[in-house]
C-alpha cells in the first residue's frame, strides 16, 4: 500500500551534469543545458516528485511527473520507460506499481540519488546513450558503482 504525502519540484541531472527533460514526443532525455537553458525550457525540465508512505520498509517511495499541457507520470511498465498521461494517485493499494520508484541516497554520497523500480527489484532508472541521444531507461544494476544509475536532484521549491 502506498499513500501520497507531499510533492516537490525538482531538476534531475545525470552525473555528467546533463539535465533531464521531456521532449516534444514525450520522451525523457538528457541534454547539456546552462542554468538559463534549464529555466527557458521549463516546465519540460521541472519534475514533480511526489512522496508516498510505504506500508513496507523499503525506502522513500516516489512518483516522477511533469506538467506540460497535462500531467504525465513516469512509468516502467514491462521495463520500458515512458510518460503516461495521468496524475499521481492519492493511494495505490498494492505493494508494487509501475509508477512507484524508491529514491535512494547512495551511502557516502548524500547528494547522489538512485531510483529503484518497485515493480522490478534491482532495476534502476539510468541514463544510456543511444546514437546521439541520452535516454532515460530502466536498467538492471549489473556492476557495482555504476554511475549511469546515479543522479542529482535539485529542489526548485
Amino acid at each position: 500500500y502506498f499513500g501520497k504525502l507531499e510533492s516537490k519540484l525538482s531538476v534531475i541531472r545525470n552525473l555528467n551534469d546533463q539535465v533531464l527533460f521531456i521532449d516534444q514526443g514525450n520522451r525523457p532525455l538528457f541534454e547539456d543545458m546552462t542554468d538559463s537553458d534549464c529555466r527557458d525550457n521549463a516546465p519540460r525540465t521541472i519534475f514533480i516528485i511526489s512522496m508516498y508512505k510505504d506500508s513496507q520498509p523499503r525506502g522513500m517511495a516516489v512518483t516522477i511527473s511533469v506538467k506540460c499541457e497535462k500531467i504525465s507520470t513516469l512509468s516502467c511498465e514491462n521495463k520500458i520507460i515512458s510518460f503516461k498521461e495521468m496524475n499521481p494517485p492519492d493511494n495505490i493499494k498494492d505493494t508494487k506499481s509501475d509508477i512507484i520508484f524508491f529514491q535512494r541516497s547512495v551511502p557516502g554520497h548524500d547528494n547522489k540519488m538512485q531510483f529503484e523500480s518497485s515493480s522490478y527489484e534491482g532495476y534502476f532508472l539510468a541514463c544510456e546513450k543511444e546514437r546521439d541521444l541520452f535516454k532515460l531507461i530502466l536498467k538492471k544494476e549489473d556492476e557495482l558503482g555504476d554511475r549511469s544509475i546515479m543522479f542529482t536532484v535539485q529542489n526548485e521549491d
Epitope: K53, P57, L144
Partner: antibody, heavy 119, light 110 residues
Framework: QVQLVQSGAEVKKPGSSVKVSCKAS????????ISWVRQAPGQGLEWMGG????????NYAQKFQGRVTITADESTSTAYMELSSLRSEDTAVYYC????????????WGQGTLVTVSS | DIVLTQPPSVSGAPGQRVTISCSGS????????VNWYQQLPGTAPKLLIY???HRPSGVPDRFSGSKSGTSASLAITGLQSEDEADYYC???????????FGGGTKLTVL
C-alpha cells in the same frame, strides 16, 4: 555530510524514564529513516525501532513495544527516543542511526549516549 | 533473541584472508538483503557493506560481501592491524517485522 549529535549521558533510577535526543545537521531529515539501536556493555547491537519523520508514525521491535516511544521534530531536525519503566538491564549505549539509502541501511550513526540504570 | 548467527571470534595474521559467516533463515536473509557493520573499540558502528555486496565510498576494496540462500559472508583480504574490530551482520526479519542483527564477531589480527 550528515552529522548526528546525541544528548549526553544519563543516570536513572529503576522504574523511571529517559529521553535521548539526536540532532541531524547537513542533510535531508524528514524523508529518511532514523532508527535507535542499543548496545549493552560487552554485548551486541539491538534494534529498538525507527521513524521516517515525514510519515509521523514509528515502528518498534516487539521486545520494546509499549515501553519505547520514538518521535521526530522536523522543525529542529531532531529525533527522540523515550524508554520508560527502566530496569538495570536497560543500562546500555543508545545510538541513533540514519538510513538514507534504505530504511534498514544505517549509513550514519550518532556518537552514542550511555544510559545507566542504577538504584 | 539473536536471529542471525555469527561465530563469536575469528583471527588471522596480517596479510591473510578471513571470512565471517552469518546464518539466518528464509524469513530474513533468505528473502532480504544483508548489511555489514564494523565497530572499532569504543566507537559507534560504521556501515561496511550494504545490499549484500555494495561498498560505501571510503571503504577499501579489501572488504567484500556475498550472500547465498539463507547465509551471508564477509571477506577481508590483506588483513591489517586496524581491521581488529567487532563485525555485525544485519537483515530484515519478516516474521518479527523487525531489523535483526547477528551477535557480532570479534576479529583479532595476530
Amino acid at each position: 555530510q550528515v552529522q548526528l549529535v546525541q544528548s549526553g549521558a544519563e543516570v536513572k533510577k529503576p522504574g523511571s524514564s529517559v529521553k535521548v535526543s539526536c540532532k541531524a545537521s547537513g542533510g535531508t531529515f524528514n524523508s529518511y529513516a532514523i532508527s535507535w539501536v542499543r548496545q549493552a556493555p560487552g554485548q551486541g547491537l539491538e534494534w529498538m525501532g525507527g521513524i521516517i519523520p515525514i510519515y509521523g508514525t514509528a515502528n518498534y521491535a516487539q521486545k520494546f513495544q509499549g515501553r519505547v516511544t520514538i518521535t521526530a521534530d522536523e522543525s529542529t531536525s531532531t529525533a527522540y527516543m523515550e524508554l520508560s519503566s527502566l530496569r538495570s538491564e536497560d543500562t546500555a549505549v543508545y545510538y541513533c542511526a540514519r538510513a538514507a539509502y534504505h530504511p534498514l541501511v544505517f549509513d550514519n550513526w550518532g556518537q552514542g549516549t550511555l544510559v545507566t540504570v542504577s538504584s | 533473541d539473536i536471529v542471525l548467527t555469527q561465530p563469536p571470534s575469528v583471527s588471522g595474521a596480517p596479510g591473510q584472508r578471513v571470512t565471517i559467516s552469518c546464518s539466518g533463515s528464509s524469513s530474513n536473509i533468505g528473502n532480504h538483503y544483508v548489511n555489514w557493520y564494523q565497530q572499532l573499540p569504543g566507537t559507534a558502528p560504521k556501515l561496511l557493506i550494504y545490499r549484500n555486496n555494495h561498498r560505501p565510498s571510503g571503504v577499501p576494496d579489501r572488504f567484500s560481501g556475498s550472500k547465498s540462500g539463507t547465509s551471508a559472508s564477509l571477506a577481508i583480504t590483506g588483513l591489517q592491524s586496524e581491521d581488529e574490530a567487532d563485525y555485525y551482520c544485519q537483515s530484515w526479519d519478516y516474521s518479527g517485522f523487525s531489523t535483526v542483527f547477528g551477535g557480532g564477531t570479534k576479529l583479532t589480527v595476530l
